[in-house]
């Protein structure tokens, strides 16, 4: 939802968290603001306190329940409002009718581990976190490997077009330190975006055997 120079963007992690960012040019930093969530067909509502993340933007997380509980479904619509205190009153600054499963951003993959490493290849696995069972296998992943002397931005993206929670990295250099990251995205949702990148996993390929061609 955008009002002039105001922007209010929220994502659902598919289970029990809605994360919101509100930005407004010229807003006072010390103003007390909240996000209110009112589902259209549930008995609960939820509020979180917006905290500054930059000069003109605030963020907060609506915690709807325990991390793995399915608090919203595919047919829920949640009215989200930004409310700011003006003296003794609250003023509505932004509003949107939020369809959770059209605005998904999953949690970053976790539990990255090296399954097997050789001189030229490395097999890595991971797990998805707090992802709804609704998706079945309809998820995709992007992965990238940081090579020595390069930046993450330079790393080519590898795409896995199915729910595959492992990858075999090939054509690596022996006895070399690498880092690896992965992120996940459901196919569902018009405004769905990639999860954050996972924490990097550092690994080292095995040295080449002495006296052998590599």
């Amino acid at each position: 939802a955008v009002n002039g120079t105001s922007r209010f963007t929220c994502f659902y992690n598919s289970r029990a968290n809605i994360s919101c960012v509100w930005s407004q040019d010229g807003a006072l930093q010390d103003t007390s603001c909240q996000v209110h969530a009112w589902p259209d067909r549930r008995r609960w509502n939820q509020t979180c306190e917006l905290l500054p993340v930059s000069q003109a933007s605030w963020a907060c997380n609506l915690i709807l329940g325990t991390p793995d509980s399915q608090k919203l479904t595919a047919v829920d619509i949640v009215t989200l409002r930004v409310m700011c205190r003006e003296g003794v009153r609250w003023r509505m600054m932004a509003i949107q009718d939020f369809k959770p499963f059209e605005n998904l951003r999953l949690m970053a993959p976790i539990s990255l581990q090296v399954v097997h490493v050789e001189t030229h290849r490395c097999n890595i696995s991971w797990k998805i976190s707090q992802a709804s069972h609704y998706f079945e296998r309809h998820l995709e992943f992007e992965a990238r490997t940081l090579s020595p002397g390069h930046t993450w931005e330079e790393a080519p993206l590898m795409t896995l077009k199915q729910k595959q929670e492992w990858i075999c990295l090939e054509t690596l250099t022996p006895d070399t330190q690498y880092e690896f990251q992965v992120r996940v995205k459901p196919l569902q949702g018009e405004f769905t975006t990639w999860s954050p990148w996972s924490q990097p996993l550092a690994f080292r390929t095995k040295p080449a055997a002495l006296g052998k061609d590599t």
């Epitope: 399915q70 479904t73 595919a74 047919v75 499963f101 059209e102 069972h133 609704y134 998706f135 079945e136 309809h138 196919l187 569902q188 018009e190």
Partner: antibody, heavy 117, light 107 residues
């Protein structure tokens, strides 16, 4: 192999209730959604509703919500659809299916229900 | 309730030729459109999800596309086993609704 096996054909009188079963195998029933779809001769395919087995939550289409009840028995990996106050236009093939909320990945073989006096 | 309109109701095509089936939504549904195939006496089978994503195990000759509220299922080179009824289904607004179907028959 994913399988959904439905109970056999039924003949019912108007006003009666029918209960169809859907026994599943080849996947984790507790982490699934089981849907029911009606295919009546003149009306095409109509989504009746679903049950989220894990949460125990149901969602019914407005056209059926007054008369349909969907349940699940996790001890037998079986879902049920009960349709009450039957009328002649409920004569149809009823399918159970597994999928996320948005589309149906695997289907049962269908159960024919005939409503006739 | 969103109304899904499929056209034509019946399509006659020769084996080996291309078939193009259309599905139009009565309002904007983003890419929340899925295609099924149903043969006589059988349950429907899922072919394409989200307008254009093929389901694993479905032959590559089946493809989907979207232009606004109009969706197209294309079968590039018809095989004998492709003659069936095809349904589209929206999942944008509950209740999800199906089109009335297009019967693809041998010319």
């Amino acid at each position: 192999e994913v399988q959904l096996v439905q109970s056999g054909a039924e003949v019912k009188k108007p006003g009666a209730t029918v209960k169809i079963s859907c026994k599943v195998s080849g996947f984790n029933f507790k982490e699934s959604l089981i849907h029911w779809v009606q295919q009546a001769p003149g009306k095409g395919l109509e989504w009746m509703g679903w049950i989220d087995v894990e949460a125990g939550e149901t969602e019914y289409a407005p056209g059926f919500q007054d008369r349909v009840t969907i349940t699940a028995d996790t001890s037998t990996d079986t879902a049920y659809m009960e349709l009450s106050s039957l009328r002649s236009e409920d004569t149809a093939v009823y399918y159970c299916a597994r999928g996320g909320p948005w589309f149906l990945s695997y289907w049962g073989q269908g159960t024919t229900v005939t409503v006739s006096s | 309730e969103i109304v899904m309109t499929q056209s034509p109701a019946t399509l006659s095509v020769s084996p080996g030729e291309r078939a193009t089936l259309s599905c139009r939504a009565s309002q904007i549904i983003s890419n929340n459109l899925h295609w099924y195939q149903q043969k006589p006496g059988q349950a429907p089978r899922l072919l394409i999800i989200y307008g254009l994503q093929s389901i694993s195990g479905i032959p590559a000759r089946f493809s989907g596309s979207r232009s606004g509220t109009e969706f197209t299922l294309t079968i590039s080179s018809l095989q004998s086993e492709d003659f069936a009824v095809y349904y589209c289904q929206q999942s944008n607004n509950w209740p999800w609704t199906f089109g009335q179907g297009t019967k693809l028959e041998i010319k």
